[in-house]
């Protein structure tokens, strides 16, 4: 019973953590406009992943995609790379990981296979969230780099009297959902990995018992049986909720004017 | 078509308070952030204040800040400006106006005149 | 605040010619996110509210003649209006539309001699 429940709660915490990681990676706000020095101002820039928006004080927002490959800094292209692995994994993972859930009967799967399926989901989901943390924080980290070069020359004076301010990003909103999602992924494997330990056979060997029948000397040495057939171990009805993320891009445009890519 | 029709204005003694309206009409109101700007001989034009079009945030003028107060009613399509403290420079033409693509302003009312004198 | 400097302050002029004014801000407008400049150009005639003419500094408002461009990047902005029309009388004022506390200029008077 324990290992049922430490299995379909690693796997709710893996499809929680995944569904957060996606979320994560589709998400503008990686990096937000620092309002630091100017708390009011009437634009403010947001970047992901993907592209950059510029949100106006008059409710217009414009996005543009990166349309380039080569032209974009390593380190972006290796958080891209290194979450949509994340994603790959844990997407794996979980379909792996359905199939050796305890409560679900799929033929006559041994329960040694269960425990494979689990361990191997267990490592892909600890991987995934292994891979999501660091693509969020090599980006953190960028981000720290370029914060303070910006702050060193924040002001490039123009003539004396003009001034240049230079735009200086801090961490959005996504990096925080990255980071648990990431926790989330990583401690629902290792959750399936303790569960799998529960769900692997252990090998029973009986000691040899002899059996005196009436006129007859016979010793019955049974071997070490298989704990279970894969049948009737439970026969509990249980409920699986299967979770999604959706990511929902508010982009505010007004109506009877040019669309901005 | 896009009407911004302003009312409220008149004279007013210093020290006292006044209550500017802004009817709009032939547009989506709630969809839009609207400003209070004024406009004087001597000083040119001035903003005022603005107020988002969920009514928040707002932002004022130091000039005014504390004095005036910008709210709107969404469902009656109306823009307020409630003045405090008046002072005689605060004598001048209100215009509302409605906020838009590159934080400028695409259609102004025709403006109401608050004098403020003993 | 964002200090915005209009020149020259009047503007004399004959119908057909080609006029120029600046506007030069005390701060860069430029917007290095979509690479715009927040600077917006106004018309206002007498007795009237000022009406939009060019905003991104050279984005033209829907149905305002091609004769209108504006110009610029950072800190200095131009205001260009070919063959002036006798209707082009007006003051003409430029805003900063980047940051709080929006300002406008002082104003460029366009006279007809």
């Known amino acids: 019973m324990a290992v049922t429940a430490c299995q379909g709660l690693g796997f709710v915490v893996s499809l929680i953590g995944i569904a957060g990681i996606i979320a994560a990676t589709c998400m503008d706000q990686w990096s937000t406009q620092d309002l630091y020095n100017n708390p009011v101002t009437a634009v403010f820039n947001y970047q992901g992943l993907w592209r950059s928006c510029v949100r106006e004080s008059s409710g217009f927002t414009e996005c543009r995609g990166y349309f380039t490959l080569l032209g974009l800094p390593a380190m972006l292209q290796a958080v891209r790379a290194l979450m949509i692995v994340g994603i790959v994994l844990g997407a794996i993972g979980l379909l792996v990981s359905i199939f050796a859930l305890k409560c679900i009967r799929i033929g006559s799967m041994e329960d040694s296979a269960k425990a494979n399926m689990t361990l191997t989901s267990g490592i892909m989901f600890i991987v995934s969230g292994l891979c999501a943390i660091a693509g969020v924080s090599v980006f953190a980290n960028m981000l720290v780099t370029n914060f303070w070069m910006s702050t060193a020359n924040m002001y490039t004076g123009m003539g004396g009297m003009v001034q240049t301010v230079q735009t200086r990003y801090t961490f959005g909103a996504a990096l925080f959902v990255g980071w648990v999602a990431g926790g989330l992924t990583l401690i629902g494997g290792v959750m399936m990995c303790i569960a799998c330990r529960g769900l692997a056979p252990e090998e029973t060997n009986y000691k040899a018992v002899s059996y005196h029948a009436s006129g007859h000397s016979v010793a019955y040495k049974p071997g070490g049986f298989k704990a279970s057939t894969g049948f009737g171990s439970n026969t509990k009805n249980k409920k699986i909720y299967d979770g999604g993320a959706r990511t929902e891009d508010e982009v505010q445009s007004y109506p009877s004017k040019h669309d901005y890519v | 078509d896009v009407q911004l029709v302003e009312s409220g204005g008149g004279l007013v003694q210093p020290g006292g308070s006044r209550k500017l309206s802004c009817a709009a009409s032939?547009?989506?109101?709630?969809?839009?952030?609207m400003h209070w700007i004024r406009q004087t001989p001597e000083k040119g034009l001035e903003w005022v204040a603005y107020?988002?079009?969920?009514?928040?945030?707002?932002y004022y003028a130091d000039t005014v800040k504390g004095r005036f107060t910008i709210s709107r009613d969404n469902p009656k399509n109306t823009l307020f400006l409630q003045m405090t403290s008046l002072r005689s420079e605060d004598t001048a033409m209100y215009f509302c106006?409605?906020?838009?693509?590159?934080?400028?302003?695409?259609?102004w009312g025709q403006g109401t005149l608050v004098t403020v004198s003993a | 605040d964002i200090v915005m400097t209009q020149s020259p302050s009047f503007l004399t002029v004959t119908a057909g010619e080609k006029v120029t004014m600046s506007c030069k801000s005390s701060q860069s407008l430029l917007n290095s996110g979509n690479q715009k400049n927040y600077l917006t150009w106004y018309q206002q005639k007498p007795g009237q509210p000022p009406k939009l003419l060019i905003y991104?500094?050279?984005t033209r408002e829907s149905g305002v003649p091609d004769r209108f461009t504006g110009s610029g990047s950072g800190t200095d902005f131009t205001l260009t209006i070919n063959n002036v029309q006798a209707e082009d009388l007006a003051l003409y004022y430029c805003?900063?539309?980047?940051?709080?506390?929006?300002?406008f200029g002082a104003g460029t008077k366009l006279e007809l001699t």
């Open positions: 032939g547009f989506t109101f709630s969809g839009f952030g």
């Open positions: 991104w500094a050279s």
């Open positions: 106006a409605r906020f838009y693509y590159g934080n400028s302003f695409d259609h």
């Open positions: 805003q900063n539309a980047y940051s709080f506390p929006l300002t």
């Open positions: 107020v988002s079009s969920g009514s928040r945030p707002i």
